[in-house]
């Protein structure tokens, strides 16, 4: 696999992550955080190694920023578990809250 295909996957993966975070903010649905974290990582990792790498880099950066702003350790662990769940190819719908609109 070429470096360029890795970069392409990383770019697409970053876009998947952005879309998931953007949907999460738009939905503003209680209990949906883990679903969106898992979905973003799942979609990105499906792109290939570059996508999985981008997902990891983005989630790590996000965690560090949130930790800096005092995001709770318990929430952080739950988010990390959901990130890893999606990245490992497990179904993000496992975390889907009842009634979340189908567009998400």
């Amino acid at each position: 696999r070429s470096f360029f295909s890795f970069l392409g996957e990383a770019f697409d993966g970053a876009r998947d992550m952005w879309r998931a975070y953007s949907d999460m903010r738009e939905a503003n649905y209680i209990g949906s955080d883990k679903y969106f974290h898992a979905r973003g990582n799942y979609d990105a990792a499906k792109r290939g190694p570059g996508g999985a790498w981008a997902a990891e880099v983005i989630t790590d950066a996000r965690e560090n920023i949130q930790r800096f702003f005092g995001h709770g350790a318990e929430d952080s662990l739950a988010d990390q578990a959901a990130n890893e769940w999606g990245r490992s190819g497990k179904d993000p719908n496992h975390f889907r809250p009842a009634g979340l609109p189908e567009k998400y």
Epitope: I30, G31, H94, P97, A98, G99, P101
Partner: antibody, heavy 121, light 107 residues
Framework: QVQLQQSGAELVRPGVSVKISCKGS????????MHWVKQSHAKSLEWIGV????????SYNQKFKGKATMTEDKSSSTVYMELARLTSEDSAIYYC??????????????WGQGTLVTVSA | DIQMTQSPASLSASVGETVTITCRAS??????LAWYQQKQGKSPQLLVY???TLAEGVPSRFSGSGSGTQFSLKINSLQPEDFGSYYC?????????FGTGTKLELK
């Protein structure tokens, strides 16, 4: 203690609709989703869908979209399921079951007593 | 949709015997499986969730095991009240689906 009380048996004509209810008590109603399950001789147990009691929004099994509509009344801690355009295939026992959280994926520790719906001309 | 297949469909046993019911998922559901018992004319009752966690108030003669696609429910030293139907259910993705059922009868 947690209790789910369902409405009584219904005998209905083909083509009409029926609305059955399930009242939750002994817990904080909006903390747990409420699911509906169909039991018929032909298909054993089938998951129909679930209503998020916090928001009042429902998620359905694709198979029951257009057939079942779930609603709730927070003030009385009651959920409702309306079944439309009934046919003999809809004759079954319908159970409400409390979810383990507000997520779709759940096991069911608490069940209503069931509502028998019979569709007959 | 994930298909859940139980075997056997029916089973005859005597009080005091040990029986095992199996449930196969059409795809990997990890450990997200529940087991229920249902007696004639009654609602199902939760026995096990997460494949092996015993629900509150369930006697220790019941035990669940398995992961991935193969699961089993074992009942040690059958009691008269254990006869009835048993169902598995996955709680992994959507839609939730139940097994085909196993009827446990007194021999």
């Amino acid at each position: 203690q947690v209790q789910l009380q369902q409405s009584g048996a219904e005998l209905v004509r083909p083509g009409v609709s029926v609305k059955i209810s399930c009242k939750g008590s002994g817990y904080t109603f909006t903390d747990y989703a409420m699911h509906w399950v169909k039991q018929s001789h032909a298909k054993s147990l089938e998951w129909i869908g679930v209503i998020n009691t916090y928001y009042g929004d429902a998620s359905y099994n694709q198979k029951f979209k257009g057939k079942a509509t779930m609603t709730e009344d927070k003030s009385s801690s009651t959920v409702y399921m309306e079944l439309a355009r009934l046919t003999s295939e809809d004759s079954a026992i319908y159970y409400c079951a409390r979810g383990s959280s507000l997520m779709i994926t759940s096991w069911f520790a608490y069940w209503g007593q069931g509502t028998l719906v019979t569709v007959s001309a | 949709d994930i298909q859940m297949t139980q075997s056997p469909a029916s089973l005859s046993a005597s009080v005091g015997e040990t029986v095992t019911i199996t449930c196969r998922a059409s795809e990997n559901i990890y450990s997200y499986l529940a087991w229920y018992q249902q007696k004639q004319g009654k609602s199902p009752q939760l026995l096990v969730y997460n494949a092996k966690t015993l629900a509150e108030g369930v006697p220790s003669r019941f035990s669940g095991s398995g992961s991935g696609t193969q699961f089993s429910l074992k009942i040690n030293s059958l009691q008269p009240e254990d006869f009835g139907s048993y169902y598995c259910q996955h709680h992994y993705g959507t839609p939730l689906t139940f097994g085909t059922g196993t009827k446990l009868e007194l021999k």
